[in-house]
Amino acid sequence: HTAAQDNCTCPTNKMTVCSPDGPGGRCQCRALGSGMAVDCSTLTSKCLLLKARMSAPKNARTLVRPSEHALVDNDGLYDPDCDPEGRFKARQCNQTSVCWCVNSVGVRRTDKGDLSLRCDELVRTHHILIDLRHRPTAGAFNHSDLDAELRRLFRERYRLHPKFVAAVHYEQPTIQIELRQNTSQKAAGDVDIGDAAYYFERDIKGESLFQGRGGLDLRVRGEPLQVERTLIYYLDEIPPKFSMKRLT
């Protein structure tokens, strides 16, 4: 739980309060809302970020067609329960005792129920499809330049290992970024694709979570890449369980 020692701030999470009262008098940064100490050398988990957000004063195809099991986060913001490691608890409930099961990115994957609802395990989201539409430009971006720039972004800004960026698809004006990360592939210390996708989503919306950094300035060969729409699909290792009523 280290932070920048010089002025005791958290470079990777502005939604923290930092104080030199950690072990050995070292700087310790706590996430707003939960008070949990965060590791400022990497991304903070989406669960703790959502909790902090709630406490603080979205023809021939080379594009991927999301599977029928893909989830979109339609429920919006909620104040989540996080486990001691900062991950989402499998079962989430609101103040009126309405409960539902979520996946590892906190997206609802069952119908809503009452307090008797059981969520046996936290189901991992192993495939995330980020669907972007960019603003009109003079011409299309070069696909390989775009691919290289987005991979660099995920590697350098979000510290996501390159092997987890499975593909970048482009069909003007739509860009799709595929992130894949199975449970077996994720080693200790690896950034979670769900956390990287959330930081990216907030960056794209102009709501950067990084401390003191300017907003995201995406450029491909000097040409600004301005996103006007974002849609994120989440695919779980186990398909979601919704009643037919919801599907119709």
Partner: antibody
Framework: QVQLVQSGAEVKKPGASVKVSCKAS????????INWVRQAPGQGLEWMGN????????NYNQKFKDRVTMTRDTSTSTVYMELSSLRSEDTAVYYC????????WGQGTLVTVSS | EIVLTQSPATLSLSPGERATLSCRAS??????IHWYQQKPGQAPRLLIY???ESISGIPARFSGSGSGTDFTLTISSLEPEDFAVYYC?????????FGQGTKLEIK
């Protein structure tokens, strides 16, 4: 040396409010959390909440959320804890304490609620 | 919230003996546990922080250990002034919580 000095004892009637102060010295006031802890007669310690003096971010124990307010005055390095709608069960010694590991404590302020 | 359970509630020992006080957390909290001593009419005093880190000015006979959910405060050889109430406290997440205390009394 680090010191936290609290205001004197108070006697209040049920339904009233009390405001206890905690003046800090000997360290950078804005860099450390100040917590409030209370102890009813013969009982254990109970955390009420804390405030980060740098930006006034405060955080309250759900039990006191509707009745407690913590504020600070950086010009005098003083933190205040106000508890409203007092009842007899609020009779206790109220302490301020610094940081996450409560390394320095005030001397305590006895608040007696009695009709 | 995280519940801390201290045991035993009362410990009766003689000066010179070794005291072992336990604190168990309802969920894993790493090493975010702190130990305090309180004597009648006084404010608590920090003895050990972050499970095992010593505090300057606190006698070396006080030591702490543990991580996760189980923590121990050990007083290697009791002195007459050590008889008091001892509390553990967690700072893993808000709300911070205290154990109910262990009273260390003279046998």
């Amino acid at each position: 040396q680090v010191q936290l000095v609290q205001s004197g004892a108070e006697v209040k009637k049920p339904g009233a409010s009390v405001k206890v102060s905690c003046k800090a010295s000997g360290y950078t006031f804005t860099s450390y959390w100040i917590n409030w802890v209370r102890q009813a007669p013969g009982q254990g310690l109970e955390w009420m909440g804390n405030i980060y003096p740098s930006d006034s971010y405060s955080n309250y124990n759900q039990k006191f959320k509707d009745r407690v307010t913590m504020t600070r005055d950086t010009s005098t390095s003083t933190v205040y804890m106000e508890l409203s709608s007092l009842r007899s069960e609020d009779t206790a010694v109220y302490y301020c304490a610094r940081g996450s590991s409560f390394d320095y404590w005030g001397q305590g302020t006895l608040v007696t609620v009695s009709s | 919230e995280i519940v801390l359970t201290q045991s035993p509630a009362t410990l009766s020992l003689s000066p010179g003996e070794r005291a072992t006080l336990s604190c168990r957390a309802s969920q894993t909290i790493g090493t975010s546990i702190h130990w305090y001593q309180q004597k009648p009419g006084q404010a608590p005093r920090l003895l050990i922080y972050y499970a095992s880190e010593s505090i300057s000015g606190i006698p070396a006979r006080f030591s702490g250990s543990g991580s996760g959910t189980d923590f121990t405060l050990t007083i290697s050889s009791l002195e007459p002034e050590d008889f008091a109430v001892y509390y553990c406290q967690q700072s893993n997440s808000w709300p911070f919580t205290f154990g109910q205390g262990t009273k260390l009394e003279i046998k």
